[in-house]
Amino acid sequence: HTAAQDNCTCPTNKMTVCSPDGPGGRCQCRALGSGVAVDCSTLTSKCLLLKARMSAPKNARTLVRPNEHALVDNDGLYDPDCDPEGRFKARQCNQTSVCWCVNSVGVRRTDKGDLSLRCDELVRTHHILIDLRHRPTASAFNHSDLDAELRRLFRERYRLHPKFVAAVHYEQPTIQIELRQNTSQKAAGDVDIGDAAYYFERDVKGESLFQGRGGLDLRVRGEPLQVERTLIYYLDEIPPKFSMKRLT
């Protein structure tokens, strides 16, 4: 057992298996469930994380009700198909040959169909609205302090460039974080807003994905910011295609 093996871990994803068997004896970490090699200097894609999560049986969780103006992840957990880069494949199917199209964050954007369903392209989610309610505090947080703290959090914990945090809105006790990232804005190496939002969502639930790191400890000027509930809305570059039946 060498020092190299001790150092060979994945700081950004605890759902991995690591060993110094990469090229030249370098550390290499593979995601559970898929065996895909991951880059541990950044966030792992949501698709690979969901796949890893499904490989470790846990109680199913139900997610929030859908919103009429934006997509909300209402289908709960599923075992996704990921492409070689770890992105969601545009078409997802379950074991009973029911298929549907998803966006870049893996949220269903069409009615469910059969194996003949076509999903021509993976549609990018370019705008994410994270809606939080914080626990009561003696007084409201200062808006500019809150804004700075959340931008710092997304940069330092989730490695997201501040330019992708479009706005932070606050009306006590509701906080809204807007993330925006068009295809043209996202450079190689940039964290995807969908991945950052997923890590944040898991952090808020007390299910941190980071290796051996304490949970999320959010403080604004020393005052703890404790989140009571979270809703995440996803807006795609191309509007979703649901039948009228779903809207009634």
Epitope: T2, A3, A4, N7, C8, T9, C10, P11, T12, T16, C18, P20, G22, G25, R26, C27, Q28, C29, A37, V38, D39, C40, S41, T42, A148, R151, R152, R155, E156, R159, H161, P162, A187, G189, D190
Partner: antibody, heavy 122, light 109 residues
Framework: QQLEESGGGLVKPEGSLTLTCKGS????????WMWWVRQAPGKGLEWIA?????????TYYASWAKGRFTISSTSSTAVTLQATSLTAADTATYFC???????????????WGPGTLVTVSS | FEMTQTPSSVSEPVGGTVTIKCQAS??????LGWYQQKPGQPPKLLIY???TLASGVPSRFKGSGSGTEFTLTISDLEAADAATYYC????????????FGGGTEVVVK
């Protein structure tokens, strides 16, 4: 724990070279970043490139260095910097340094090599 | 993004105090390091996280600030403190910018 650069020397304009940074007393397969920084004679410090030496090999380059400089880590004991199309303006002492954290955006350099001098002249 | 360091040079007597300022053009929270470099040597880390003293560095060196304004204060100056000092951040490295300040030469009289 120490770092040592090698590969410097006299290079002709438009020439190329490969600099190597080797670590002793520790392994490069940890969860940190390695950096190349240069310093022209009598001038300040200038970042060139960075590479993650854990799983993944992510890299970042200074805008001016993209295309002419390539950072790589092919083994658990060395990081290299390849430079092409060199000009007199590239004459400098080239340092490699180890970042102290696994987060590239919150990094500082707690271990430096002594540097290797590269002179570009005909 | 740019790191602006002032002054470029300062001269103070032994026992005196030197203050070096570093200004970031964007908010970098507390992600700032200070280095000391003597001729013919590589830089040496003095302070990280804007205010945390690196191992083995005397408490005469003090870092402060956050956001965009940072200060390095060296009190009870000694002859051995004569060097060039640099501030540094990697907060915007993905923009391909140099995170080092221009340097401040400290002359101890």
């Amino acid at each position: 724990q120490q770092l040592e650069e090698s590969g410097g020397g006299l290079v002709k304009p438009e020439g190329s070279l490969t600099l190597t940074c080797k670590g002793s007393g520790f392994d490069f397969s940890g969860t940190y970043w390695m950096w190349w920084v240069r310093q022209a004679p009598g001038k300040g410090l200038e970042w060139i490139a960075s590479i993650y030496v854990g799983s993944g090999s992510s890299t970042y380059y200074a805008s001016w260095a993209k295309g002419r400089f390539t950072i790589s880590s092919t083994s658990s004991t060395a990081v290299t910097l390849q430079a092409t199309s060199l000009t007199a303006a590239d004459t400098a002492t080239y340092f490699c340094a180890r970042g102290a954290t696994n987060n590239v955006f919150m990094n500082y350099f707690n271990l430096w090599g002594p540097g290797t001098l590269v002179t570009v002249s005909s | 993004f740019e790191m602006t360091q002032t002054p470029s040079s300062v001269s103070e007597p032994v026992g005196g105090t030197v203050t070096i300022k570093c200004q970031a053009s964007e908010d970098i929270s507390s992600n700032l390091g200070w280095y000391q470099q003597k001729p013919g040597q590589p830089p040496k880390l003095l302070i990280y996280g804007a205010s945390t003293l690196a191992s083995g560095v005397p408490s005469r060196f003090k870092g402060s600030g956050s956001g965009t304004e940072f200060t390095l204060t060296i009190s009870d100056l000694e002859a051995a403190d004569a060097a060039t000092y640099y501030c540094q951040t990697s907060y915007y490295i993905d923009d391909g910018v140099n995170g080092f300040g221009g340097g401040t030469e400290v002359v101890v009289k």
